[in-house]
């Protein structure tokens, strides 16, 4: 079996303030089992945007039904975008762990740019 890759096909996305941003991410394998998380930024200071396993993320919805059998689409939509949302977003696959899941592989990132609303 080929090792899982995390594909973020869009290097950059431009969204108008107030609109919804779609950040695309797919995995190439069902193995290993484990959740996806989305972060803005990289390194220890990165900001968690969405965690499939747990948490409440009112601005975020998933594009696909995560409970759909054999789902490998982990794209998200972020609503009501503001200039503060600009940055690079990473889709990160975690491997089921005991007691905690372990980061397995990250996508290359998608840079979100926000176009100001015309006044």
């Amino acid at each position: 079996e080929e090792e899982l890759q995390v594909i973020q096909p869009d290097k950059s996305v431009l969204v108008a303030a107030g609109e919804t941003a779609t950040l695309r991410c797919t995995a190439t394998s069902l193995i290993p089992v484990g959740p996806i998380q989305w972060f803005r930024g990289a390194g220890p200071g990165r900001e968690l945007i969405y965690n499939q396993k747990e948490g409440h993320f009112p601005r975020v919805t998933t594009v696909s039904d995560l409970t759909k059998r054999n789902n490998m689409d982990f794209s998200i939509r972020i609503g009501n975008i503001t200039p503060a949302d600009a940055g690079t977003y990473y889709c990160v696959k975690f491997r089921k762990g005991s007691p905690d899941d372990v980061e397995f592989k990250s996508g290359a990132g998608t840079e979100l740019s926000v176009r100001a609303k015309p006044s």
Partner: antibody, heavy 119, light 110 residues
């Protein structure tokens, strides 16, 4: 840490119904299937049914389709399995189990609920 | 429905020796390049524990003396060097269709 806490042991008369609960914690309840499996004393595992808490989609083992009903309460992250028209051969330990990979498998299990059917 | 048949029903193996349990499906459990077979271990008074998923992938925290192999209709769970704590009943499960379990194999120490 994923936990599935089941309700306590039950003793029922033939013809009665039983409703077993399974309270989930440590993860987003609506993102993962819940399975129900039973095990009669000294016997093997028998799959009953599964439910997707996000939309209440269910799949049943044909053997139980007419007697079992799965439900969930997303406000309390609790799954329920009701079995009607109980017979002595329904005496078993009933387990709930969570499917962490949408593979129709059982990654995390409750401790089980013993249901005894006796006149 | 897919029927899973395990063999043998019971098995006695010496400590440190290899234990092999087989699971045969009544039709193929393969789809889209994956084999939808899972292996569980159950010790007395405990719920089952997932060992292997998609035929050959070790679940988190499972010792690497356990391994799974096979494709199509024939699958094997192998314990390379039996330890005392491996005494249990082992079940295969398929999910190519809706889940079904094999009848179980009881593993004891010789």
């Amino acid at each position: 840490q994923v936990q599935l806490v089941q309700s306590g042991a039950e003793v029922k008369k033939p013809g009665a119904s039983v409703k077993v609960s399974c309270k989930a914690s440590g993860y987003t309840f609506t993102n993962y299937w819940i399975n129900w499996v039973r095990q009669a004393p000294g016997q093997g595992l028998e799959w009953i049914a599964m439910i997707d808490p996000s939309d209440s989609e269910t799949h049943y083992n044909q053997i139980f389709k007419d007697r079992a009903t799965l439900t969930t309460d997303t406000s309390t992250s609790t799954a329920y399995m009701e079995l009607r028209s109980l017979r002595s051969d329904d005496t078993a330990v009933y387990y709930c189990a969570m499917d962490y990979g949408s593979l129709y498998a059982m990654d995390y299990w409750g401790r089980g609920t013993l249901v005894t059917v006796s006149s | 429905d897919i029927v899973l048949t395990q063999s043998p029903d019971s098995l006695a193996v010496s400590l440190g020796e290899r234990a092999t349990i087989n699971c045969r499906a009544s039709k193929s459990v393969s789809s889209s390049g994956y084999n939808y077979i899972f292996w569980y271990q159950q010790k007395p008074g405990q719920p089952p524990k997932l060992l292997i998923y998609l035929a050959s992938n070790l679940d988190s925290g499972v010792p690497d003396r356990f391994s799974g192999s096979g494709s199509g209709t024939d699958f094997t769970l192998t314990i390379s060097s039996l330890q005392a704590e491996d005494v249990a009943v082992y079940y295969c499960q398929e999910s190519r269709e809706l889940p079904t379990f094999g009848q179980g194999t009881k593993l004891e120490i010789k």
